[in-house]
Interface confidence: low
């Protein structure tokens, strides 16, 4: 199994970043970390989407990776998409330093995210608590600012 993966985030605008993934054991947590720049200050939804297809930009990536057919939630929620990694926080310089440990995504098996698309969104993810239908699907996180296909790393 792969133990490391990487994603280069790019978009039509100024947002770009590099995100690393590391999983030391096949059933263990995945470390997700790196940096994203060019964001507006504040929270931005951060999700793994189903398809590794960026042919028409980030929209080609489809919905959140959700092999268990659950509703959208936060990374600490039982009811969540596999791809629900919550939010990243950009500072006043537009830089988000990412350091997440997640026990639902994996670099192998049914929850494998390799070959899928990582997306950073325009707005904050309400973690499924927004009170409308869109909240249970996307967290009302808005448009897709930048994305990249998650690939195996050395």
């Amino acid at each position: 199994m792969a133990t490391k993966a990487v994603c280069v985030l790019k978009g039509d605008g100024p947002v770009q970043g590099i995100i690393n993934f590391e999983q030391k054991e096949s059933n263990g947590p995945v470390k997700v970390w790196g940096s994203i720049k060019g964001l507006t200050e504040g929270l931005h939804g951060f999700h793994v989407h189903e398809f590794g297809d960026n042919t028409a930009g980030c929209t080609s990536a489809g919905p959140h990776f959700n092999p268990l057919s659950r509703k959208h939630g936060g990374p600490k929620d039982e009811e969540r998409h596999v791809g629900d990694l919550g939010n990243v926080t950009a500072d006043k310089d537009g830089v988000a330093d990412v350091s997440i440990e997640d026990s639902v995504i994996s670099l192998s098996g049914d929850h494998c995210i390799i070959g899928r698309t990582l997306v950073v969104h325009e707005k904050a993810d309400d973690l499924g608590k927004g009170g409308n239908e869109e909240s249970t699907k996307t967290g009302n996180a808005g448009s897709r600012l930048a994305c990249g296909v998650i690939g195996i790393a050395q």
Epitope: N20, E22, K24, K31, W33
Partner: nanobody, 116 residues
Framework: QVQLVESGGGIVQPGGSLRLSCVAS????????MYWHRQAPGKRRELVAG???????YFADSVKGRFAISRDNTKSSLYLQMNSLKLEDTAMYYC??????????WGQGTQVTVSS
């Protein structure tokens, strides 16, 4: 509130080396990720390197193979060993913790100048 103090900066010729240190005012054992950033005059701040408590490391492409990061939780310290320095490495270097809550904790910086 964690206070971070960087040291070790200076003026060095291209190809030279420097070792930056960052000492925290209290234990860093519970701080998962610690980072070195840099900012050159007129440029956006850039994440250079980072290290988590379990030893996972991150390096910007521009410094891979030249810089090494380490931490010593017993000394509440973070280090950045910079080798084969280039003119473009000239910047103010800052030590920082994971921004949780944002913007995390930051030091005042130490200046690195690479000049021939």
């Amino acid at each position: 509130q964690v206070q971070l103090v960087e040291s070790g900066g200076g003026i060095v010729q291209p190809g030279g080396s420097l070792r930056l240190s960052c000492v925290a005012s209290e234990s860093i054992s519970d701080i998962d990720a610690m980072y070195w950033h840099r900012q050159a005059p007129g440029k956006r701040r850039e994440l250079v390197a980072g290290i988590t408590n379990d030893g996972t490391e991150y390096f910007a492409d521009s410094v891979k193979g030249r810089f090494a990061i380490s931490r010593d939780n017993t000394k509440s310290s973070l280090y950045l060993q910079m080798n084969s320095l280039k003119l473009e490495d000239t910047a103010m270097y800052y030590c920082a913790t994971l921004p949780n809550p944002p913007p995390g904790y930051w030091g005042q910086g130490t200046q690195v100048t690479v000049s021939s």
